[in-house]
Interface confidence: low
């Protein structure tokens, strides 16, 4: 979690002098309670927006918007504390709107916005707006909270953000899997326009339980420029056990921008439905998955480099 450093955030508006300050997330009114406190925010809305940094990078940001209730408590409203909590890490970041003038009722409802919290792909946040001063102990709460889920890098707008592009979001490998004779599986995918090595990881499971019964890793060496966007093929020899038939295939790139932390693409191949005539055929009903960057199969030095097939169809 961080704040955009450009442009400087603004909370002043017509009829209100205001400044945005960094906050420790512990407003003074928690420690020194006041007798008269304002009511809670109304209609808190969180939306995904996108912002450019001075360096030209594009980042997802949380756009926070809320309005004030039309009651007399606005006379005691001294500001607001905005808090964003990243749920998987418990990391919290806060800013404070400090009102430098008294609010007065006017012909339209007071509305506030803030769009400077930079968020990460595929993360969930709890956004809280606390009106200040905070209430006395056992007083009515004067905050409103909402959860906000940031889409992953498969989302069209997210795909072109700096954190997603850095992890390889623009590459679509279009993985296909084909079962062959003699316990073999052929994996094909489209190479990206970078001379980078790839790994193809196969893990097989039994149909009846989630029991891993076979795994192998194969290396594809960095393609030459003329091979960019071509199809690469890797053929795996599968376990001889017929019950070891549920296959999970991952393609892991090593792009220079993310090295070992690139987004992986995966497909699963279910066990075949047993029928009278079982003819090997392309698997059409695999389930495409978008794997997170971290995973249990990070780069191993003992991958099976010797038996990798690297064919290109021109």
């Amino acid at each position: 979690l961080r704040l955009l450093d450009f442009p400087a955030p603004v909370c002043a508006q017509e009829g209100l002098s205001c400044r945005v300050k960094n906050s420790t997330c512990l407003d003074d009114s928690w420690i020194h309670p006041r007798n008269l406190t304002p009511s809670s925010p109304k209609d808190l809305q969180i939306q995904l927006h996108f912002a450019h940094t001075q360096q030209g990078d594009l980042f997802p940001v949380a756009h926070i918007e809320w309005t004030l209730q039309t009651d007399a408590s606005i006379l005691y409203l001294e500001g607001a504390e905005l808090s964003v909590l990243q749920l998987n890490t418990n990391e919290r970041l806060c800013v404070r709107f400090e009102f430098l003038s008294k609010l007065r009722h006017h012909h339209r409802r007071w509305r506030f916005t803030f769009s400077h919290f930079v968020v990460d792909p595929d993360q969930e946040y709890e956004v809280t707006v606390h009106h200040l001063p905070k209430p006395i102990p056992d007083g009515d709460p004067n905050h409103q909270s909402k959860n906000f889920l940031v889409p992953d890098c498969e989302h069209a707008r997210m795909k072109v953000t700096t954190p997603c592009m850095s992890s390889g979001s623009l590459w679509d490998p279009n993985i296909t899997v084909e079962t062959l004779e003699a316990h073999q599986l052929r994996v094909s995918f489209t190479l990206w326009n970078e001379s980078t090595p790839y790994q193809v990881l196969l893990e097989s499971f039994s149909d009846s339980e989630n029991h891993s019964c076979f795994d192998v890793v194969k290396q594809i060496f960095a393609p030459r420029q003329e091979e960019f966007h071509q199809r690469a093929n890797v053929t795996f020899t599968l376990s001889k056990f017929h019950w070891c038939c549920h296959h999970h295939v991952q393609v892991q790139p090593f792009f220079s921008s993310c090295l070992n932390d690139c987004l992986r693409h995966a497909v699963t191949v279910p066990c075949p439905v047993i029928s009278n005539t079982t003819v090997p055929k392309p698997v059409a009903d695999y389930i495409p998955l978008w794997e997170p960057r971290s995973g249990s199969s990070d780069y191993k030095d003992d991958d099976d480099k010797g038996s990798s097939h690297h064919h290109h169809h021109h």
Epitope: D120, T162, S195, L259, N260, D261, R293
Partner: antibody, heavy 118, light 107 residues
């Protein structure tokens, strides 16, 4: 402004320990892998360690493997290098460095000096 | 592990001269190579990445070429401010080894 600031260097006896820190600002630290690189007095650059954005992948140079531990706290925008069983040859300026999208390391700290001597 | 070597280890040239530094990898590394400039008492600065791409803000007199095992850094017209040590570095796979450096000064 994109910035890396190292701290924690100092004088330590052989066999001792130090913990280096690198404070990052001006960019989304949690989106970037990070590296430690060192430079012994009058010598060239030596890559020391790498940690991926979410700590899922970690690498060390053979010369420090088993003695140094790289870690990060994305909540605090900080990178760390725990150095144990220090030797004379670990005396160097230690830099933290951010990989560039596309390759190389485009953001470096000013460095912190570690002196191992009895 | 892949070893990186640089030649020459040092050179002296006149202002305006064309200067060439070579870097060799013991195995192919495609174009996963960066060049850095380090002035005395300063931290290194990225000049070239992906073997031939000029880093933003770096003067155009610097250029890089090569792929696989042999790489070259060229300064087309040496300037007094180019006095420094130049390092190559591979980054295709760990360890992300640096070359031993080439010290450049003015005659």
């Amino acid at each position: 402004e994109v910035q890396l600031v190292e701290s924690g260097g100092g004088l330590v006896q052989p066999g001792g320990s130090l913990r280096l820190s690198c404070a990052a600002s001006g960019f989304t630290f949690s989106s970037y892998s990070m590296n430690w690189v060192r430079q012994a007095p009058g010598k060239g650059l030596e890559w020391v360690s790498f940690i991926s954005a979410r700590s899922s992948t970690i690498y060390y140079a053979d010369s420090v493997k088993g003695r140094f531990t790289i870690s990060r706290d994305n909540a605090k925008n900080s990178l760390y290098l725990q150095m144990n069983s220090l030797r004379d040859e670990d005396t160097a300026v230690y830099y933290c460095a951010r990989p560039k999208v596309g390759g190389g390391m485009d953001v470096w700290g000013q460095g912190t000096t570690v002196t191992v001597s009895s | 592990d892949i070893q990186m070597t640089q030649s020459p280890s040092s050179l002296s040239a006149s202002v305006g001269d064309r200067v060439t530094i070579t870097c060799r990898a013991s195995q192919g590394i495609s174009n996963y190579l960066a060049w850095y400039q380090q002035k005395p008492g300063k931290f290194p600065e990225l000049l070239i990445y992906a073997a031939s791409t000029l880093q933003s803000g770096v003067p155009s007199r610097f250029s890089g070429s090569g792929s696989g095992t042999d790489f070259t850094l060229t300064i087309s017209s040496l300037q007094p401010e180019d006095v420094a040590t130049y390092y190559c570095q591979k980054y295709n796979r760990a360890p992300f080894t640096f070359g031993p450096g080439t010290k450049v000064d003015i005659k």
